[in-house]
Amino acid sequence: LEVQVPEDPVVALVGTDATLRCSFSPEPGFSLAQLNLIWQLTDTKQLVHSFTEGRDQGSAYANRTALFLDLLAQGNASLRLQRVRVADEGSFTCFVSIRDFGSAAVSLQVAAPYSKPSMTLEPNKDLRPGDTVTITCSSYRGYPEAEVFWQDGQGAPLTGNVTTSQMANEQGLFDVHSVLRVVLGANGTYSCLVRNPVLQQDAHGSITITPQRSPTGAVEVQVPEDPVVALVGTDATLRCSFSPEPGFSLAQLNLIWQLTDTKQLVHSFTEGRDQGSAYANRTALFLDLLAQGNASLRLQRVRVADEGSFTCFVSIRDFGSAAVSLQVAAPYSKPSMTLEPNKDLRPGDTVTITCSSYRGYPEAEVFWQDGQGAPLTGNVTTSQMANEQGLFDVHSVLRVVLGANGTYSCLVRNPVLQQDAHGSVTITGQPMTFPPEA
């Protein structure tokens, strides 16, 4: 019995659902009563899911698997694995027995995008050309381990004094911290590029340093020029700093964070103590760093609704303020592709290809391309619907007349994360069925 599975690993984002495709060709008169279908982990032989004696025996794998029961009779033995975890990565074997027996193994490659790196500079005051500084680039909750590249403002690699560490958390996701020690020139941009090798997703952060003395007078409050990009569900640091004068004590400090537009209070430090969060109890200051001029705000479990501008007010004797923008983002899932009609296709047939990608933010850009990368702009309809958390589900439909053969690719781009998720359908010149059986 010939059992077909994809040659390439199935790539699934942590937290999304994955389909491990497996198919066989049922003979005429085949009934499900004849079928024994077993999915198991290839290495350990642990049972994952089974269908025997004419019925679904259910999931033996943390109750997170399901078969496509309505498609089983047509030879679709695929397995749906829900809420993918890092620990799921590996090889799954699909055993099919009717009268004959066949099996094949499919690999699951788990991935998670890295957050936009946050950049910190030490020391960060009174910098002069010739000073040695430490620039730290931190990017969170990605998988698998990242590749980290440092570049100057012209793109030249900075390979000198770089130390990169990657630590896995309890879910197996990696936090990356890369430290560059560099001697300052007259001015310079230092960029850190964190690459997810599986998703081919690059997240980058930059810091531009113009060494000079700060002007005296009003309190100079520094915030990042670029928006702080935070993934939904992660924590974000809204950086804000000031330069305390000699003899400064926290008793002199009034620090207020508020929403720029509505002036809603977010967090405050006055009268020498932390007055706490006024923003759903999800904010915190870095109290141990406040005396050194670090007025940054930590915003926990970021939501879409948090997007916008936050103002950092600092008053000692003088007064200063600056606003920092928070840009919320969520990666789109790998698109699922459906084809209608999906049987006995011939050149000249008109088909509808649907590309669906879920739970991203902000709204996606959708591109359709043929196998050579040429855009397919003809008959395309794209809709994007926000769920109750404000995350978008994208559905894009392409109507196309089949040629002798062709690949139709849908690319769903997150414009903020610069993350592309794509799915493809390849249709050959022979009469065929989708998903392909070979």
Epitope: Q151, D152, Q154, G155, P157, T159, N187, G188, T189, S206
Partner: antibody
Framework: EVQLQQSGPELVKPGASVKISCKTS????????MHWVKQSHGKILEWIGG????????TYNQKFKDKATLTVDKSSSTASMELRSLTSEDSAVYYC?????????????WGQGTLVTVSA | QIVLTQSPAIMSASPGEKVTMTCSAS?????MHWYQQKSGTSPKRWIY???RVASGVPARFSGSGSGTSYSLTISSMEAEDAATYYC?????????FGAGTKLELK
């Protein structure tokens, strides 16, 4: 449409200097570094250096450090390269090429090239 | 500096033939780019980040490799593929190119 339009061919005498330009359009000039590449008659490509129009930072191939000076004019979205103390070895086609920073995407767009001929 | 050695220097292929050219680095590099140049025109980015095919490049082109050994492959040669192909690295300074592989139509 992204375009990198280079200045015309130059015939210069040995020992002289020449300044060639690369006028850009179709994108935000300050968001990309501009690099320069030499292609001599043997078809060998050599990287000269690059400049970040945003802050004016430059990175040079040490081989060309005393030969080339890179500048930008943000107001006209134009990058320029001056070559000095020219010899016959400097006769070549010089290309400007756009580079997204930071990235590992290589030179995504190239100018059409400027032929510099050094001859007495 | 990292020296990139391309081989062969010149090769020819018939239409439909599979073509592979290589680029060997004197030290390990993180990624490789490939450019196509036809006579009298500027180089064009063809493959970047080792294996990513640039926009508009036919799907018959692919790139692979790691460390010191990289290659560009054409699954089925076509007349329009006749050109010179250059590899390029910038994992360490200075940025360097290979001397090129000239691909001719047989």
């Amino acid at each position: 449409e992204v375009q990198l339009q280079q200045s015309g061919p130059e015939l210069v005498k040995p020992g002289a200097s020449v300044k060639i330009s690369c006028k850009t359009s179709g994108y935000t000039f300050t968001e990309y570094a501009m690099h320069w590449v030499k292609q001599s008659h043997g078809k060998i490509l050599e990287w000269i250096g690059g400049i970040n129009p945003n802050i004016g930072g430059t990175t040079y191939n040490q081989k060309f450090k005393d030969k080339a000076t890179l500048t930008v004019d943000k107001s006209s979205s134009t990058a320029s390269m001056e070559l000095r103390s020219l010899t016959s070895e400097d006769s070549a086609v010089y290309y400007c090429a756009r580079f997204l920073v930071p990235s590992t995407e290589g030179f995504t767009y190239w100018g059409q090239g400027t032929l510099v001929t050094v001859s007495a | 500096q990292i020296v990139l050695t391309q081989s062969p220097a010149i090769m020819s292929a018939s239409p439909g033939e599979k073509v592979t050219m290589t680029c060997s680095a004197s030290s390990s590099v993180s990624y490789m780019h490939w450019y196509q140049q036809k006579s009298g025109t500027s180089p064009k980015r063809w493959i970047y980040d080792t294996s990513r095919v640039a926009s508009g490049v036919p799907a018959r082109f692919s790139g692979s490799g790691s460390g010191t050994s990289y290659s560009l492959t054409i699954s089925s040669m076509e007349a329009e593929d006749a050109a010179t192909y250059y590899c390029q690295q910038w994992s360490s300074n200075p940025l360097t190119f290979g001397a090129g592989t000239k691909l001719e139509l047989k």
